[in-house]
Amino acid sequence: QRLPRMQEDSPLGGGSSGEDDPLGEEDLPSEEDSPREEDPPGEEDLPGEEDLPGEEDLPEVKPKSEEEGSLKLEDLPTVEAPGDPQEPQNNAHRDKEGDDQSHWRYGGDPPWPRVSPACAGRFQSPVDIRPQLAAFCPALRPLELLGFQLPPLPELRLRNNGHSVQLTLPPGLEMALGPGREYRALQLHLHWGAAGRPGSEHTVEGHRFPAEIHVVHLSTAFARVDEALGRPGGLAVLAAFLEEGPEENSAYEQLLSRLEEIAEEGSETQVPGLDISALLPSDFSRYFQYEGSLTTPPCAQGVIWTVFNQTVMLSAKQLHTLSDTLWGPGDSRLQLNFRATQPLNGRVIEASFPAGVDSSPRAAEPVQLNSCLAAGD
């Protein structure tokens, strides 16, 4: 059942963007979806520097000084455990086979907090977004992206890393979140479900969308990802929900049409450069923002999450291709690669628009008016 849309805006432009997010049945995450905090890890359970993962595998950036042994972005593998109660719990295990890079698998032991203590942190991602409780913050101005329209050459690396499909982005893609918050895009990847089962990481009033795109950025204040991990604002992720629409999305088709070539875990191909901004919604002015974490071990906090209010439309066939083409570790289909939503623990989600006004049909509970924390432009 689909409930009225979050905001009755007509979509801007057209292209890849759909209308604003529809809400679904109340399906709030259950208590056991949160990472367990008992059983703190022993010394041997902590990942070494070379094992540090991030929000999927982060592509390499040239550090200002090429130090021997410094963490490269390629050394950051990750995986999310499915977040619905019927799915395996929020656990993963490390796998050191083949190229000796760490991999994370769905299900199994040990629990994430034992692998990386930060996964039991208080300010984790993803979260459930409740527009009625979001703080309208007029200081949150429209996002600005620079250099996201890429020419066909040089080609970009598209890789099945065993837990997502990831496109490594070249230098020169800049994103501005506001005063003192300039970022460079590193990579983008997707999260999805399975046939008839949605797989977005964030949810809206408990509604999970079919899929979600993440564009991961590094603050220009840092030369390397390992320097930025855990630092407030060191990393920023743009997130958008993908949902089913009547037409094929030509921007996404440039990637989805190549998935068969990388069906096997660890395989990769080269794809022509494309308009990365066309993979995102067209309305850069309406979004939610909060501080959270990487959605996979090491679950480093301080990540600025910006979740678009407007969704992106893909055809049913495209969503099926996304969820039914790739294979993960152990001859298992790469599906349901999302983490359970995490408790806010007092965090306030800010909105760049008055999201609480007529944004949800549920008026049973009183609306809490949260105040905007951001400073003006």
Partner: antibody, heavy 119, light 107 residues
Framework: EVQLVESGGGLVKPGGSLRLSCAAS????????MSWVRQAPGKGLELVAA????????YYLDTVKGRFTISRDNAKNTLYLQMNSLRAEDTALYYC????????????WGQGTLVTVSS | DIQMTQSPSSLSASVGDRVTITCKAS??????VAWYQQKPGQAPRRLIY???NRYTGVPDRFSGSGSGTDFTLTISSLQAEDLADYYC?????????FGGGTKVEIK
């Protein structure tokens, strides 16, 4: 009050050099992207060069690459444009422009300094 | 490079008229478009950013709209002091490019 004051323009022979300066006041200079934009007499606007807040990212118009250098001194609140191997087609009014805080769009412009390249 | 094709190149209208200036980008620039006003002998002045956001202090008769490749600046009720050149600019991709300008004259 935001103020941008350009200086350093003048008449120079082809092949010559000039260094333009833009003195900024009324805002925290080190937080802002800055650009040089030029306008040939009776013509439209053209972005010449841009630099991010810490000077780590620079951009140049293709026709000035290798000849012009944009730089900034955040301690002195000053933006520079070093112009070498000047050509007649570089003749224009050169504006210093500030970008919105933390963003790429420009919000304040100086009054400009005129560069004339002629033999 | 992204071309910004601005039209008309000039127009003449009466005080109180509604004036529309259009700008077409040669490729998708999302909403990364700004509009500037340049009065004779002066530096450009900011009007609109992110396609439709008016800067503080800009009269509300000025409005911007559009997304993707087609953008519009509208002056809902032309005033005598609006005599100027108007430029659109995209800042989605380097090189940031400006439209050719529209000269607005008062009849």
């Amino acid at each position: 009050e935001v103020q941008l004051v350009e200086s350093g323009g003048g008449l120079v022979k082809p092949g010559g050099s000039l260094r333009l300066s833009c003195a900024a006041s009324g805002f925290t200079f080190s937080n802002y992207y800055m650009s040089w934009v030029r306008q040939a007499p009776g013509k439209g606007l053209e972005l010449v060069a841009a630099i991010n807040s810490d000077g780590g990212i620079t951009y140049y118009l293709d026709t000035v690459k290798g000849r012009f250098t944009i730089s900034r001194d955040n301690a002195k609140n000053t933006l520079y444009l070093q112009m070498n191997s000047l050509r007649a087609e570089d003749t224009a009014l050169y504006y210093c422009a500030r970008h919105r805080s933390g963003y790429f769009s420009m919000d304040y412009w100086g009054q400009g300094t005129l560069v004339t390249v002629s033999s | 490079d992204i071309q910004m094709t601005q039209s008309p190149s000039s127009l003449s209208a009466s005080v109180g008229d509604r004036v529309t200036i259009t700008c077409k980008a040669s490729q998708n620039v999302v909403s990364a478009v700004a509009w500037y006003q340049q009065k004779p002998g002066q530096a450009p002045r900011r009007l609109i950013y992110s396609a439709s956001n008016r800067y503080t202090g800009v009269p509300d008769r000025f409005s911007g709209s559009g997304s993707g490749t087609d953008f519009t600046l509208t002056i809902s009720s032309l005033q005598a002091e609006d005599l100027a050149d108007y430029y659109c600019q995209q800042y989605s991709n380097y090189p940031w490019t400006f439209g050719g300008g529209t000269k607005v004259e008062i009849k």
